[in-house]
């Protein structure tokens, strides 16, 4: 009784199940009766991740500089080659196709989280008590001077793009 | 490169037992099924028998059903015909043949067999 | 057990003409799994096309091979003087036992 579904790692071709090839190889014929699955492992430059059937391995991704990107691991017969963007520049997308450079924060917002290869900057308002008066990628809100422990009294109210004034306090005769 | 190389032919009276050999070389012998093929003078081809990659399934032709065993050494990289009670209808050039899902793709050079009084 | 009949017997022509050899199943091929085969005087055969269609590595795509169920053609577009040898048919999925068919000569007109 020829088989209608097979084991895992298996595939069915013509009432048969075969052995699927291993990572980093690819499917030269199907097997026989008599014959096992025949493979052929990836070239230097190709890769195959999963148990497969596939007739030909999948090209590693090129890693383009004139797009900003760089090897971040070299691929191997059975993993694809991973790109990340070169300093100052992230991926556009999760598979990292294309770089971009990474936004500054604007005077009012600080940087919550500082960008990487992969993710961008990631900004949020200050909130009362601090301020940024710069657009950076880098820099976080400072707060206002404290007047009060330098013994001086506020003279201009601090916004979320100014810092505090402080002055000396009027001395009262 | 991927080759079989047939040895052990010869003339032999009737009656008489006689065992070829087919040594691999270039693949994964043990990955593969291995066949007999034989060619009569001036005659076609006929299928004569096959073994499985690990030795467990043998088929044969009716015309050696009985008289012909196939076996293998993986670990020589050699497939073996042992022919018993030789007839003179066995004279035949004899090969063997690699099997795959593509048909019979490698085939030795052959040995010939001459069974004669 | 199938039966596979070539025809013609014999072809006789001349280098650079087309060559057409039938090889005709008593039932059905299974998943066409069909070969052709090439002998010249005193070599093993040599495989040519299997799947009934798909060429072997390294066989010139002046041999083609088509056809189903149990009518199978070989063609060969324009004979090459190294061409004229005798062809065998074979059937490699219907088991035991594995057949050929008794084989067409392409002989030199």
């Known amino acids: 009784e020829p088989p209608t579904a097979c084991r895992e790692k298996q595939y069915l071709i013509n009432s048969q199940c075969c052995s699927l090839c291993q990572p980093g190889q690819k499917l030269v014929s199907d097997c026989t009766e008599f014959t096992e699955t025949e493979c052929l492992p990836c070239s230097e430059s190709e890769f195959l991740d999963t148990w497969n059937r596939e007739t030909r391995c999948h090209q590693h991704k090129y890693c383009d500089p004139n797009l900003g990107l760089q090897v971040q691991q070299k691929g191997t017969s059975e993993t694809d080659t991973i790109c990340t963007c070169e300093e100052g520049l992230h991926c556009t997308s999760e598979s990292c196709e294309s770089c971009v450079p990474h936004r500054s924060c604007l005077p009012g917002f600080g940087v919550k989280q500082i960008a990487t290869g992969v993710s961008d900057t990631i900004c949020e308002p200050c909130p009362v008590g601090f301020f940024s008066n710069v657009s950076s990628a880098f820099e976080k809100c400072r707060p206002w001077t404290s007047c009060e422990t330098k013994d001086l009294v506020v003279q201009q109210a601090g916004t979320n793009k100014t810092d505090v004034v402080c002055g000396p306090q009027d001395r009262q005769r | 490169q991927v080759q079989l190389v047939e040895s052990g032919g010869g003339v032999v009276q009737p009656g008489r037992s006689l065992r070829l050999s087919c040594a691999a070389s270039?693949?994964?012998?043990?990955?593969?099924?291995m066949h007999w093929v034989r060619q009569a003078p001036g005659k076609g081809l006929e299928w004569v028998a096959v073994?499985?990659?690990?030795?467990?399934?043998?088929y044969y032709a009716d015309s050696v059903k009985g008289r012909f065993t196939i076996s293998r050494d993986n670990s020589k990289n050699t497939l073996y015909l042992q022919m018993n009670s030789l007839r003179a209808e066995d004279t035949a050039v004899y090969y063997c043949?690699?099997?795959?899902?593509?048909?019979?793709?490698?085939w030795g050079q052959g040995t010939m067999v001459t069974v004669s009084s | 057990e199938i039966v596979l009949t070539q025809s013609p017997g014999t072809l006789s022509l001349s280098p650079g003409e087309r060559a057409t050899l039938s090889c005709r199943a008593s039932?059905?091929?299974?998943?066409?799994?069909l070969a052709w085969y090439q002998q010249k005087p005193g070599q093993a055969p040599r495989l040519l096309i299997y799947?009934?269609?798909s060429r072997a590595n390294g066989i010139p795509d002046r041999f083609s091979g088509s056809g189903s169920g149990t009518d199978f053609t070989l063609t060969i577009s324009r004979l090459e003087p190294e061409d004229f040898a005798v062809y065998y048919c074979?059937?490699?999925?219907?088991?035991?036992?594995?057949?050929f068919g008794g084989g067409t000569k392409v002989e030199i007109k």
């Open positions: 043949a690699r099997d795959t899902s593509r048909g019979h793709d490698i």
């Open positions: 039932q059905s091929v299974s998943y066409s799994y």
């Open positions: 074979s059937d490699y999925a219907d088991y035991p036992p594995f057949t």
């Open positions: 073994i499985s990659y690990e030795g467990e399934k043998k």
């Open positions: 799947g009934a269609s």
């Open positions: 270039g693949f994964t012998f043990e990955k593969y099924g």
